[in-house]
């Protein structure tokens, strides 16, 4: 993989420790928390990033209506278990032996249980809806300009193949970005939509994961786009399994 050879850093992940101890003295970077080697030419998996974050010291168009099965990450931060490829393990447990099943983006998709809970497979999140609300601007954004700018962003900054940006919807002041990626569509080397969405979310929050970058500030044809709030909905290939108690809460 490529890390900046001169000063040996990881351009795509600041939550790493890098040293020239790779083959032939090449720069090798390992994720904080897990110590796993990361590929600095692409995005690091969300599981490794969450683990690193937990180890770090504290510091006219109709919009899409999320389906009834859409998940929102309400549980927040936890220290996840990652598999050898850096993916989330299907079952996650905390220190008090409370366990739950997660999807491929690490969001809980079942009720919490005990150590006897079984999660047979890691269910893939194949559809992500990023819902943004922007602050007042000089005027409404031109939809095609906004669409082009957001597609460019996901292609250039997050290295996500354009075919995975399914749509950009706009009804001032709401912007929705739809990412879709089925298991069958994702080829080796393709950035995962869950990882791209996580990098985007952190960028919007002013917590860029890229080395030496501040937060992401978007502009469309020169016009500053100041985001007021962000909501991300996750849709899995298999609907989540929650008890009726949760659904009626």
């Amino acid at each position: 993989h490529t890390a900046a050879q001169d000063n040996c850093t990881c351009p795509t992940n600041k939550m790493t420790v890098c040293s020239p101890d790779g083959p032939g003295g090449r720069c090798q970077c390992r994720a904080l928390g897990s110590g796993m080697a990361v590929d600095c030419s692409t995005l690091t998996s969300k599981c490794l990033l969450l683990k690193a974050r937990m180890s770090a010291p504290k510091n006219a168009r109709t919009l899409v209506r999320p389906s009834e099965h859409a998940l929102v990450d309400n549980d927040g931060l936890y220290d996840p278990d990652c598999d050898p490829e850096g993916r989330f393990k299907a079952r996650q447990c905390n220190q008090t032996s409370v366990c739950w099943c997660v999807n491929s983006v690490g969001v809980r998709r079942t009720d919490k249980g005990d150590l006897s809970l079984r999660c047979d497979e890691l269910v893939r999140t194949h559809h992500i809806l990023i819902d943004l609300r922007h602050r007042p601007t000089a005027g409404a954004f031109n939809h095609s300009d906004l669409d082009a700018e957001l597609r460019r962003l996901f292609r250039e900054r997050y290295r996500l193949h354009p075919k995975f940006v399914a749509a950009v919807h706009y009804e001032q002041p709401t912007i929705q970005i739809e990412l879709r990626q089925n298991t069958s569509q994702k080829a080796a080397g393709d950035v995962d939509i869950g990882d791209a969405a996580y990098y985007f979310e952190r960028d919007i929050k002013g917590e860029s994961l890229f080395q030496g970058r501040g937060g992401l500030d978007l502009r469309v044809r020169g016009e500053p786009l100041q985001v007021e709030r962000t909501l991300i909905y996750y849709l899995d290939e298999i609907p989540p399994k929650f008890s009726m108690k949760r659904l009626t809460a």
């Epitope: 000089a138 929050k205 007021e228």
Partner: antibody, heavy 119, light 106 residues
């Protein structure tokens, strides 16, 4: 290199209007908005508003709505600010500024136009 | 509007001193914070953006930290050319500046 060159100092009477200019060079004028910021003697910097030369769209600080008018001339790569109904507290240095290429912070600034309002 | 409160409003220091200026926002600004240096009769100069990112050409003795509502500008070893007024600015919701901190020679 990027440059913002502002018009010269002005002395005005209360109730009058003043119009100042900001000529941009060294970059594509329509790529960025132009902000206007003022600084009264011994006071903090105060954002007035911005104009997007692409479409002449404007956004103002509520405090200046109705009194400040921002315009631009693409062919001359120049932005203008007019402030009407001047009062003594409008005595200040008025700056134009361009955003940073990566963020909404202000990277390049004009040298400032001093406006003195006095009877 | 988001209010920005800087402290102290002025400080006296000597060459070589470590100087810290703080800026508090009235609400979370998600690291959309810039620091500027201004010398008398001159326009402000951008030092840092995104709370921690150093603008090109700015000496590494300047650094920024913070998150949420609380941010800090640190000059690790004050140089003669650093005596000036420093302003913080938020750009999360429109643009507002702090009242400034004047760094004077002791």
């Amino acid at each position: 290199q990027v440059q913002l060159v502002q018009s010269g100092a002005e002395v005005k009477k209360p109730g009058a209007s003043v119009k100042m200019s900001c000529k941009a060079s060294g970059y594509t004028f329509t790529t960025y908005v132009i902000h206007w910021v003022r600084q009264a003697p011994g006071q903090r910097l105060e954002w007035i508003g911005y104009i997007n030369p692409n479409n002449d769209g404007t956004k103002y600080n509520e405090k200046f709505k109705g009194r400040a008018t921002l315009t631009s001339d693409k062919s001359a790569s120049t932005a203008y600010m007019e402030l009407s109904s001047l009062r003594s507290e409008d005595t200040a240095v008025y700056y134009c500024a361009r955003p940073h290429f990566e963020t909404h912070a202000m990277d390049y600034w004009g040298q400032g136009t001093l406006v003195t309002v006095s009877s | 509007d988001i209010q920005m409160t800087q402290s102290p409003s002025s400080l006296s220091a000597s060459v070589g001193d470590r100087v810290t200026i703080t800026c508090k926002a009235s609400e979370d600004i998600f690291n959309r914070l810039a620091w500027y240096q201004q010398k008398p009769g001159k326009a402000p100069k951008l030092l840092l953006y995104g709370a921690t990112s150093l603008e090109t050409g700015v000496p590494s003795r300047f650094s920024g930290s913070g998150s949420g509502t609380d941010y800090t500008l640190t000059i690790s070893s004050l140089q003669p050319e650093d005596f000036a007024t420093y302003y913080c600015q938020q750009y999360w919701n429109t643009w507002t500046f702090g009242q400034g901190t004047k760094v004077e020679i002791k």
